[in-house]
């Protein structure tokens, strides 16, 4: 057991052009605060991963508010160390997140508001025990400085905390097979001391609290022996009884991952997959739970009511993340329709509509004909938001009210002369020609392309079509 | 300006399913968590739960097991279904919406009363 | 769950007299998520307060709440007679949402 320390050193803009506009104004207040999250390994693993090693959040910060026209300077921090206590052993790698937050201070809708000003994330090998390291990040036009370090919780020593001390029982020398503490030279290794239980003649351990099985052996404290009668997955040598393979102890046997976690085996001992809200070799140890505010931007924290369940967040429209932490372009997801502008707000999101649709979401088509009378007998026609009038013969113009000139349009055809007439028009067709717009050509032997025309009619005559 | 209006059946029997439908009006659905609460005739406020349009749903544990909420976007509705009502599922059940800036009620139907009795 | 306890069960007070109605949390409310409602008689509840200190839109300013972590509370100045109704605190930090009993304001 142990801990994990981090010392914000500043945070303010880089080096370099583009410096950052300060994150608080006369207007918006702010404070800052940190957040550091630690993984096992050097995993690249997503921000929303969990933090199997732990997570930690300062304090807030003294609130800042920006001198008008001055750059961003180092902002104020907020007081003392992150620690991330840790029970088992320390990995020796880890990959570490640590976000800056700032909290605005302003009138904002339902209290303040957090957001997430930058991210910074690493690999590193670090022994407990070790001096602080130093270490310099940048995100965008921001750079964190800061130190950490890993110790070891007495009794508790060595580079992975996994050897345990204790007082010499006597001045000059330590037990049988037990050697002196370094750097504590007055103090004894300490033997082992395996999970609580554990079959003095079946098992052992390597870290405290472990039980791990000899051969032929099983069960969370090495008390049952392993069935001969299958041997269906053999691992360990042959039974000099039986004459077949006796599965050997497999580290997973009796699962020791608590909280639903999920056991693999390894080439040394086991790992754990726990599941969201645990953390810890054996996924024992729960890292944040509603009691600790985890939601941000006005989520609602559902279960983690207790250590031993795991949070989630439900997120206001408009943020999203496992923490709420990330604001949302609302209107990225289109949600007016028919061509609405959409508005964002913050508080709400309005849709402003084209002609011819309504609703909250332009979802409405109007009845762009409702109340909508065409004069003379014209019908009206919806159509894309907007009405028209289809006009009777004779009439046009958007309510047909207007008297059309019917021979505006120049409809008769191959240099036919058209006639205005109260039922419409008549066109006179050019020599050659016939038909209600003199579309037809007369063939030369005075037979036409149509059946023969009507009685009293000869070809080339005025052509009335009612 | 938004609107919201309760409706269903205002009598049930024992062990039947209380069903009510909301019909919001003045915004869409697809914006806001949507939520039922009820109150016995005389006495304080009790969430039943929510949902929002993408699924989400969250339920009072103490009606979890009987309770289901749904959403009709086509009809900017939301309804509540809880089962094997009784006696003591008598109340004044209103709909309403869920603020955008966190989980409280900014806008509630007028509220139904609905009595459990054969 | 988060209980929430309001006092005094009933305040009997004049018009024009200041109402202070208290809101108690078992366990601490997250960032003051804390909302306050008024019911009148056959009506739905109407916001009051969010964010224990935020006033709703239209609410007269002589609603005025304050307060953090379990303990909250509601100030009426100057009573008017439409004021007169029954007052709710909810929790909105941790799930599930909680109300409080409610403090009735009577005309005394």
């Known amino acids: 057991a142990g801990v994990f320390e981090l010392q914000i050193h500043s945070f303010g803009p880089g080096p370099g052009p583009g410096a950052p506009r300060s994150p608080c104004s006369a207007r918006l207040p702010c404070r800052l605060f940190f957040r550091v999250c630690l993984k096992p390994g050097l995993s690249e693993e997503a921000a929303e991963s969990p933090c199997a090693l732990g997570a930690a959040l300062s304090a807030r910060g003294p609130v800042y508010t920006e001198q008008p026209g001055a750059p961003a300077p180092d902002l104020p921090l907020p007081d003392g160390l992150l620690q991330v206590p840790f029970r088992d052993a320390w990995p020796g790698t880890f990959s570490f997140i640590i976000e800056t937050w700032r909290e605005e201070l302003g009138d904002q809708i339902g209290g303040p508001a957090w957001s997430l000003l930058a991210r910074v994330a690493g690999r590193r090998r670090l022994a407990a025990g070790g001096p602080w390291a130093r270490d310099i990040q940048r995100a965008g036009a921001w750079e964190l400085r800061f130190s950490y370090r890993a110790r070891c919780e007495p009794p508790a020593v060595g580079t992975a905390c996994t050897r345990l001390c204790r007082p010499r029982s006597a001045p000059s020398r330590c037990g049988p097979g037990l050697r002196p503490c370094a750097p504590l030279e007055d103090e004894c290794e300490a033997p082992l001391v395996c999970r609580a239980g554990c079959s003095p003649e079946h098992g052992f351990c390597e870290q405290p609290g472990e039980c791990r099985c000899l051969e032929g052996w099983t069960g969370p404290l090495c008390t049952v022996p392993v069935s001969t009668s299958s041997c269906l997955s053999p691992r360990g040598p042959s039974s000099a009884t039986t004459g077949c393979l006796v599965p050997g102890p497999g580290p997973c046997d009796g699962n020791p991952c608590a909280n639903g976690g999920s056991c693999s085996e390894t080439p040394r001992s086991f790992e754990c997959t726990c599941p969201r809200g645990f953390y810890g070799l054996r996924c024992e140890v729960s890292g944040v739970t509603c009691a600790d505010g985890p939601c941000f931007n006005g989520g609602l924290c559902v279960g983690g009511a207790d250590p031993d369940s795991a949070y989630i967040c439900h997120c206001p429209p408009g943020f999203q993340g496992s923490n709420c932490e990330k604001r949302v372009d609302r209107c990225s997801l289109q949600p007016c329709r028919n061509g609405g502008l959409c508005l964002d707000l913050g508080h709400a999101l309005r849709c402003r509509c084209r002609a011819g649709f309504a609703g909250p979401r332009c979802e409405h088509d109007l009845d762009d004909c409702a109340g909508r009378a065409c004069a003379n007998g014209g019908t009206c026609v919806e159509g894309g938001g907007a009405h028209r009038c289809s006009c009777a013969l004779g009439f046009g113009g958007r309510d047909c009210r207007e008297r059309a000139d019917p021979c505006a349009a120049r409809p008769c055809a191959h240099g036919g002369r058209c006639y205005a007439h109260f039922s419409g028009l008549v066109c006179a067709c050019a020599p050659g020609y016939m038909g209600a717009r003199c579309e037809f050509p007369v063939h030369p032997d005075g037979a036409s392309a149509l059946p023969a025309a009507p009685p009293g009619l000869r070809p080339g005559d005025p052509q009335r079509y009612l | 300006q938004v609107q919201l209006q309760e409706s269903g059946p205002g009598l049930v029997k024992p062990s039947e399913t209380l069903s009510l439908t909301c019909t919001v009006s003045?915004?869409?659905?697809?914006?806001?968590?949507w939520s039922w609460i009820r109150q016995p005739p005389g006495k304080g406020l009790e969430w039943i739960g929510y949902m929002y349009y993408s699924g989400i749903t969250n339920y009072n544990p103490s009606l979890k097991s009987r309770v289901n909420i749904s959403l009709d976007t086509s009809k900017n509705q939301f309804s509540l279904k809880l089962g094997s009502v009784t006696a003591a599922d008598t109340a004044v059940y209103y709909c309403?919406?869920?603020?955008?800036?966190?989980?409280?009620?900014?806008?509630w139907g007028q509220g139904t009363l609905v009595t459990v009795s054969s | 769950e988060i209980v929430l306890t309001q006092s005094p069960g009933t305040l009997s007070l004049s018009p024009g007299e200041r109402a202070t109605l208290s809101c108690r949390a078992s366990?601490?409310?997250?960032?003051?998520?804390l909302a306050w409602y008024q019911q009148k008689p056959g009506q739905a509840p109407r916001l009051l307060i969010y964010?224990?200190?935020s006033r709703a839109t239209d609410i007269p300013d002589r609603f005025s709440g304050s307060g953090s972590g379990t303990d909250f509370t509601l100030t009426i100045n100057r009573l008017e007679p439409e004021d007169f109704a029954v007052y709710y605190c909810?929790?909105?930090?941790?799930?599930?949402?909680?109300f409080g009993g409610g403090t009735k304001v009577e005309i005394k």
């Open positions: 003045g915004d869409s659905i697809s914006s806001y968590y």
């Open positions: 964010g224990a200190s």
């Open positions: 366990q601490s409310v997250t960032r003051s998520y």
């Open positions: 309403a919406r869920l603020s955008v800036a966190g989980f409280y009620f900014d806008y």
């Open positions: 909810q929790q909105y930090g941790t799930s599930p949402l909680t």
